[in-house]
């Protein structure tokens, strides 16, 4: 919609355009108009943008009108939510951005028969983007001068500059998303695609075997399995195989069948001939051992002379028998083939929970801490391993020991410090616990055994100057006599800080008072009303750039006063026929030296460099990545050895390349795992492993591989009125104003008229980085002086 | 106000197909998303499928995809549900239904239509 | 497909507060809203809550409705005689990619 306010009305006379009278008829005496005042009310007519402006024709982008809101001259600056000052124009098509105003000041003749009557009318031609801010406009000429705001605002979720971009964020099953500043989607956490209804897998999930419908998903094809989809599912019964694809069953080295559950080296895995045989496969699951003299049986395990094989271990003696033979085992070994040791800890014969360790043909007991002996029947002395730490002594006891504690110290092993702090310490002092005893630490202003003691800061006489001092807590006060100030009455207060005196005035300091020594053409206490000369001396105009006054401080008895025309950027300079120019200072152009030369002509600026226009100077502003008087330089992304891991590091513009070696990933190789952490795109991109790469997908206004290059779209078309300089600022831009021009986007114009340089009751007519003096009667020149 | 009218009841041997309609007033159909929604004697309501709001196409229930076709014409304001290889089964009252601008549930409702397949 | 599961009725006197539940999984209620619609005998559906908790105009305030976890309740306080009707709770579901209802409650006022 097209809002409009209006802020002020002067008609001064109460007169209408045609030069009549709003009510009544006008005093002879005066000529001013009499009775009562306009009924002030405004028209507005918004069409299509038109160079040349024609009233009539319909207001195709809408019209409205105001009702009466006052009379000649009011101001509405102040009142806030007043809706009666305000026309709204909604608008259902896309704002074209530029457009012509009509806006018409009538007054109201409160009568069916008698018209209403046009005071002033203004049109306006121009361009406003949808915004906030308003835009405050003027109409300065004919019977009434009246000042009124513009702007254009979109409707909620319509975006950009026709209003015509649509997003409403929503988040349920046909989309989850949030809408950013130009109308764009931004997907939440989770989801992507267009309308953000597409999930985002688990990370590393196999794009091909895998998919998901809810974040963080991975669901297996048909044949597939694992948190990733990407481990295949082997034929149902495969034994000692693997799969490459879905349901094969590819044997492991020395297995076959079609289950790969046949032994192929039946001998290898089993190791079945006894007794120095040696086996052969023989096919699946089949082997076959020949045996060494002495042995036979499928397994070899048949000796034909029994104890030719040493069968009795741990040097028992064998005999053979008619059943084979019979093993006489050494002490403390039995069985068969004296293999088993005898178990000496049957019964346990350690005491006080000794644990029994058997032994060959003997046991060991492993006695707890008290005890000792070969069956922990002794008691020991633990004494003997120093475990008193702060102690006067220690005492042996059966089964036990006793430490005689130093004072201050606790516990069985007297190692527990007696915390001794038992709230001794006042004025929120800290307790220090000591050994046997404590220490307070004093907060700041406190003292004594137990901070028990205010500190009387005023012990040292530190006031100066015969200033009183008041002792307070950590800190003191010094009460300053008349005359003196600071913390220690160390200042004779300096009434000339800061300097009250104006217009170049010399400032003395006194004890209790200052003094202004006034120049010539000023007087009061500060210097700060311009003398009237003219009723005592008369003024004579030497040329179109000096007047010439009577003065007593010149030996001539005359003093020169230069005009200031050329504002602060040139000089007068006096032509024939009561005309003058302006000689400019470096930098400056125009009639009255009101004009910066623009330095940027040039486009100095190099690599997308913002170049700012100064005075007969320029500065560069570079884009991301550069640096330079001009621009020229591309910064080295590499100087901090951002590649761990052996990585090899390239720059490039804004940013650098790790050529990383030995598996290692992401972007700086510091990941075995992952190509992705949360620093790899910048200006919150959303970081895709893509398997030996990452991808970054930036937000609006951000490019390149880690989004670090902020887009100039934010600065196209210029946002920047009145031949600002655009710089790019992220997703937004920041405008740089020409001399004249102010605000966030150059639109507004700069008070020229800003501190009064008309004299003598002259007005002042702000222009476009100008002014003009219009004067009082009686009083001319450039400055009315 | 929205408004959804639907044809009148119909009576279809197994096997043939029933086309049902739905005419809009009160807004224009390219402004609405309309689902199909039906209720089977003694039974629950069942979705059928509808306009997608976001990806602007038509979706339809796992179930019926390969017999169920939902077409709209503008020019008449009228959404049209053709559901093919009719059974028995298929006996019910159909439910055209809007759903909400910015939500996820169904604000308006036609009157239903009965379509009985008997032989 | 499983569906949502809502008890087949429920009965309450004049006055009485009853509550029909309705249970899901996560790939339904656990990851979209609720909504509940309200089926009286010979009429079209009319919607009752919708987004959880919200209710629509018209709808008086002793319909209320909430959501936890993968389970929704739908809450009638100070039932009344014309509030005999069938109810249903739906979501939108993920892996069916449609609309699945609830098979229905159907609440009789003694």
């Known amino acids: 919609q097209f809002e409009l306010e209006i802020l002020s009305m002067q008609n001064v006379n109460g007169e209408l355009q045609n030069g009549n009278c709003c009510g009544g008829a006008r005093n002879p005496g005066d000529r001013k108009c009499t009775r009562d005042e306009c009924d002030t009310y405004f028209k507005v007519c918004l069409k299509e943008y038109q160079s040349r402006v024609t009233a009539g024709g319909p207001c195709s982008f809408g019209s409205g009108s105001t009702p009466v809101i006052g009379g000649n001259t009011f101001n509405l600056k102040a009142s806030r939510g007043n809706d009666r000052n305000r026309i709204v124009l909604p608008f259902s098509f896309a704002w074209p951005r530029s457009y012509t105003l009509l806006v018409e000041a009538w007054d109201s003749s409160n009568d069916t028969v008698q018209p209403d009557s046009i005071i002033e009318k203004a049109s306006h031609s121009g361009m406003i983007n949808p915004s906030r801010q308003w835009q405050t406009l003027k109409q300065n000429t004919g019977v009434a001068h009246f000042e009124y705001q513009i702007r254009v605002t979109c409707d909620d979720y319509y975006y950009g500059f026709g209003c015509n971009k649509f997003c409403r964020p929503r988040d349920d099953f046909f989309g989850h998303y949030a809408c950013d500043q130009n109308g764009n989607k931004t997907c939440m956490e989770g989801w992507m695609g267009p309308e953000c209804n597409r999930a985002i897998c688990r990370q590393g999930c196999s794009p091909k075997h895998g998919s998901c419908k809810l974040p963080g998903d991975c669901r297996c094809q048909y044949g597939w399995q694992g948190l990733y989809c990407d481990k295949c599912i082997p034929h149902p019964g495969c034994v000692h195989g693997i799969c490459n694809e879905p349901w094969q069953c590819l044997c492991e080295t020395n297995w076959g069948g079609q289950l790969c559950d046949k032994d192929l080296n039946y001998c290898g895995t089993h190791q079945p001939c006894l007794n120095g045989g040696t086996c052969s496969n023989t096919g699946p699951d089949k082997y076959q051992c020949s045996c060494p003299e002495g042995y036979s049986g499928p397994n070899c395990e048949i000796a034909e002379h029994a104890c030719l094989s040493d069968p009795c271990h741990n040097r028992g003696s064998c005999k053979e028998t008619s059943l084979g033979f019979e093993c006489e085992c050494s002490p403390g070994w039995t069985g068969p083939t004296c293999s088993t040791n005898i178990d000496d800890c049957s019964p346990n014969n350690c005491s006080h929970g000794g644990t029994c360790q058997d032994l060959v043909n003997g046991f060991k007991c492993v006695c707890p801490p008290q005890w000792t002996g070969k069956t922990c029947q002794l008691d020991a002395n633990e004494c003997e391993a120093k475990p008193c730490v702060n102690a006067k002594s220690c005492k042996n006891l059966i089964a036990s020991y006793y430490c005689d504690c130093l004072p201050g110290w606790m516990g069985q092993n007297c190692d527990i410090n007696i915390n001794d702090c038992l709230g001794q310490c006042q004025n929120d002092a800290s307790c220090r616990d000591l050994v046997n005893g404590y220490r307070c630490i004093c907060p700041p202003g406190y003292a004594g055994d137990h901070c028990e003691r205010d500190i009387d800061e005023c012990a040292s006489n530190p006031c100066l100057n015969g200033g009183h001092c008041q002792n307070e807590i950590n800190r003191f006060q010094c009460l300053c006599p008349t005359g003196f100030s600071g913390n220690l009455c160390q200042l004779d207060i300096d009434y000339c800080e800061p300097n009250p005196c104006q217009n170049g005035a010399q400032c003395y300091n006194r004890a209790s008072d200052y003094f202004c020594k006034c120049p010539e053409d000023y007087e009061g206490k500060n210097c700060s009303h311009l003398k009237d000369h003219c009723r005592t001396t008369p003024c004579e105009v030497i040329d179109s750039c000096t007047v010439a006054m009577a003065s007593n401080d010149t030996p001539e008895g005359v003093r020169y006063i230069s005009s200031n025309v050329c504002g602060p950027h040139g000089k007068c300079k006096s032509q024939s026929g009561g005309k003058f120019t302006c000689d400019c200072n470096k930098g400056f152009t125009g009639t009255y030296c009101h004009e910066n030369i623009n330095d940027c002509e040039s486009n100095p600026c190099r690599n997308g460099g913002t170049c700012i226009d100064g005075v007969n100077s320029y500065k560069c502003i570079c884009s991301d990545g550069w640096e330079g008087a001009y621009c020229e330089t591309n910064i080295n992304d590499c100087s901090q050895n951002p590649c761990h891991n052996g990585g090899t590091c390239r720059d490039l513009v804004n940013d650098f390349y790790c050529d990383c070696k030995n598996g290692w990933k992401g972007k700086t190789c510091h990941s075995r795992d992952s190509q992705c952490d949360e620093a790899t795109c910048n200006n919150g991109g959303t970081c895709y492993d893509e398997g030996d790469a990452f991808k970054c997908m930036c937000p609006g206004g951000w490019e390149g591989t880690t989004c670090n290059i902020a887009r100039n779209s934010s600065c196209l078309p210029n946002p920047c009125h009145n031949g600002g300089t655009c710089v790019v600022n992220g997703e937004s831009f920041t405008c740089v104003c020409k001399e004249g021009w102010e605000g966030p986007i150059c639109a507004q114009n700069t008070n020229d008229c800003s501190p009064h340089p008309c004299y003598n009751s002259g007005t002042c007519v702000d222009g476009d980085n100008w002014y003009r003096c219009e004067c009082a009667p009686g009083f001319a020149g450039p400055d009315c002086r | 106000q929205v408004q959804l009218v639907q044809s009148g009841a119909e009576v279809q041997k197994p096997g043939a197909s029933v086309k049902v309609s739905c005419k809009v007033s009160g807004y224009t159909l390219s402004e609405l998303s309309i689902h199909w929604v039906r209720q089977a004697p003694g039974k629950g309501l069942e979705w059928m499928g509808g306009f997608d709001p976001e990806d602007g196409k038509i979706v339809y229930a796992q179930k019926f995809q390969d017999r169920v076709s939902m077409t709209q014409d503008t020019s008449t304001d009228t959404a049209y549900l053709q559901l093919s290889s009719l059974t028995s089964g298929d006996t019910a009252l159909y439910y055209c239904a809007t759903l909400a601008q910015w939500g996820d549930w169904f604000d308006r409702w036609g009157q239903g239509t009965l379509v009985t397949v008997s032989s | 497909q499983a569906g949502l599961t809502q008890p087949p009725s429920a009965s309450g006197t004049p006055g009485q507060r009853v509550t029909i539940s309705c249970s899901g999984s996560s790939s339904n209620i656990g990851s979209n809203t609720v909504n509940w619609y309200q089926r009286l005998p010979g009429t079209a559906p009319k919607l009752v809550v919708y987004?959880?908790?919200q209710r629509p105009s018209g709808v008086p305030d002793r319909f209320s409705g909430s959501k936890s976890g993968t389970s929704a309740s739908l809450v009638i306080s100070g039932l009344q005689s014309e509030d005999e009707a069938d109810y249903y709770c739906a979501a939108w579901d993920y892996d069916e990619e449609g609309l699945l209802f609830g098979g229905g409650t159907q609440l009789t006022v003694l």
């Open positions: 987004s959880n908790n």
